[in-house]
């Protein structure tokens, strides 16, 4: 029974996005009155793990020595004090990268773009995926992703940017993922440096609607043709 106790804080070190095989530590911090900590993983039998508190009893450590697919997912923690169990923490989403081979990221027509013009970043995966994520290094809100609306799997997704400003310049990578677990991502693509030249400035760039395409009939090397509907992918800003 959840009581009136304040909810604990849940976090992961070195972070919540972990490469396959790397270690990660999940921390749950409650109060000095805590007697026991419990970690629950969504869609797993509860509790996923229990730990005694570390001195001075206000937090517990849950160790994952080697990240695998089984550990990826959504976690919450609780603590028990003499008066009962706390409220659940806010969720922690533990994401594993390296689940699939890296996609390839291209800039069309070129990674050298004049301010005010358009550019499209194209992320292509080896196997069909239904989610593509575009990451910009050192951005305040770096994550942009496209998800298939009907679970239709695609080999590629386009991220158009128009009009381009200096704000768009920087280093990008993309990831791909399957719908059955958005906590499992591919290796990151090789970095793509987008270089914006010129002086047309727009302080609030707005990427246009994203498009996902099925393979073309001739010029989509080693991609199946006609196997995927042209239903678009839904864009999400995060």
């Amino acid at each position: 029974q959840a009581g009136p106790l304040p909810k604990p804080t849940l976090w992961a070190e070195p972070g919540s996005v972990i490469s396959w095989g790397n270690s990660v530590t999940i921390w749950c911090q409650g109060t000095l009155e805590a007697r026991e900590y419990r970690l629950d993983k969504e869609e797993s039998p509860a509790p996923w793990d229990r730990q005694n508190p570390l001195e001075p009893k206000n937090k517990a450590r849950f160790s994952i020595p080697s990240m695998t697919e089984d550990y990826a997912g959504r976690y919450r923690c609780y603590y028990r004090s003499p008066v009962g169990w706390s409220q659940p923490s806010d969720p922690l989403e533990l994401v594993m990268t390296g689940a699939y081979s890296k996609p390839t990221l291209s800039a069309l027509p070129s990674p050298l773009v004049t301010s005010g013009k358009s550019v499209t970043l194209l992320c292509q995966s080896r196997s069909p995926m239904d989610t593509f994520l575009l990451i910009k290094e050192r951005a305040a809100h770096p994550l942009l992703h496209l998800r298939s609306e009907h679970g239709a799997q695609q080999h590629q997704a386009e991220f158009p940017m128009s009009p381009v400003t200096s704000v768009h310049g920087g280093t990008y990578r993309c990831f791909s993922s399957h719908g059955f677990s958005h906590y499992l991502l591919s290796h990151p693509s090789d970095p793509l440096e987008l270089i914006v030249s010129g002086s047309l400035e727009d302080p609030r760039p707005s990427p246009t609607r994203s498009v996902s395409t099925a393979a073309g009939p001739e010029d989509q090397p080693l991609m199946p043709t006609g196997s995927v509907p042209h239903s678009g992918l839904r864009r999400h800003w995060e």
């Epitope: 081979s101 069309l108 194209l122 499992l184």
Partner: antibody
């Protein structure tokens, strides 16, 4: 560290079959295609086909279709290639290789198959 | 099938000198969808498995020394070793991954002069 470790050398008679294994470690096994490549003694490389461990999907070079069969055991992170109706020209080193984006970023050490009467 | 033809078949170069290996494909490996060339280069030392050097015609694989460089587009490609080292003695293969079946060049044997 990504590793592909193949089974040992085989000597077979013409008409027999051989099954070569490739055990993967050091990466997320299910999400990467594994291909097989043939290299006859002193010759070049020839692609045989691939298997996708996640769902068992296979594709074969037409030249090997009907004679090569690729299978996967996810519980042991191992892929297998069986080559049937062996003939002398099948004498070669057979490599498994992990596909990145249709190119191969990691290779097994190779398995020598000798077909001789 | 796409036919890959390498030249020369063998090459002898002095230590510290430049080595150049060519690879020609029977059709273009340049995709108009992403402006990339679907070509890789491998190095195979005696008794060893091949090792990936270059992909997308010019992207060096992690850990590969920067004396190795790939160039070219369409149907004509080059692998250049800017300053040959003793450990570079090997057979070098190009591979197209534009279409199935995947195909390799016949190989170029690189030796020390």
């Amino acid at each position: 560290e990504v590793q592909l470790v193949q089974s040992g050398a085989e000597v077979k008679k013409p008409g027999a079959s051989v099954k070569v294994s490739c055990k993967a470690s050091g990466y997320s096994f299910s999400g990467f295609y594994i291909d097989w490549v043939k290299q006859p003694p002193g010759k070049g490389l020839e692609w045989i086909g691939y298997i996708f461990p996640s769902n068992g999907e296979t594709s074969y070079n037409q030249k090997f279709k009907g004679r090569a069969t690729m299978t996967v055991d996810k519980s042991t992170s191992t892929v297998y290639m069986e080559l049937s109706s062996l003939r002398s020209e099948d004498t070669a080193v057979y490599y498994c290789a992990r596909q990145a984006f249709y190119y191969f970023d990691y290779w097994g050490q190779g398995t020598t198959v000798t077909v001789s009467s | 099938d796409i036919v890959m033809t390498q030249s020369p078949d063998s090459l002898a170069v002095s230590l510290g000198e430049r080595a150049t290996i060519n690879c020609k494909s029977s059709q273009s490996l340049l995709s108009s969808s992403n402006q990339k060339n679907y070509l890789a280069w491998y190095q195979q030392k005696p008794g060893q498995a091949p090792r990936l050097l270059i992909y997308w015609a010019s992207t060096r694989e992690s850990g590969v020394p920067d004396r190795f460089a790939g160039s070219g587009s369409g149907t004509d490609f080059t692998l250049t070793i800017s300053s040959l080292q003793a450990e570079d003695v090997a057979v070098y293969y190009c591979q197209q991954y534009y279409s199935y079946p995947l195909t390799f060049g016949q190989g170029t044997k690189l030796e020390i002069k």
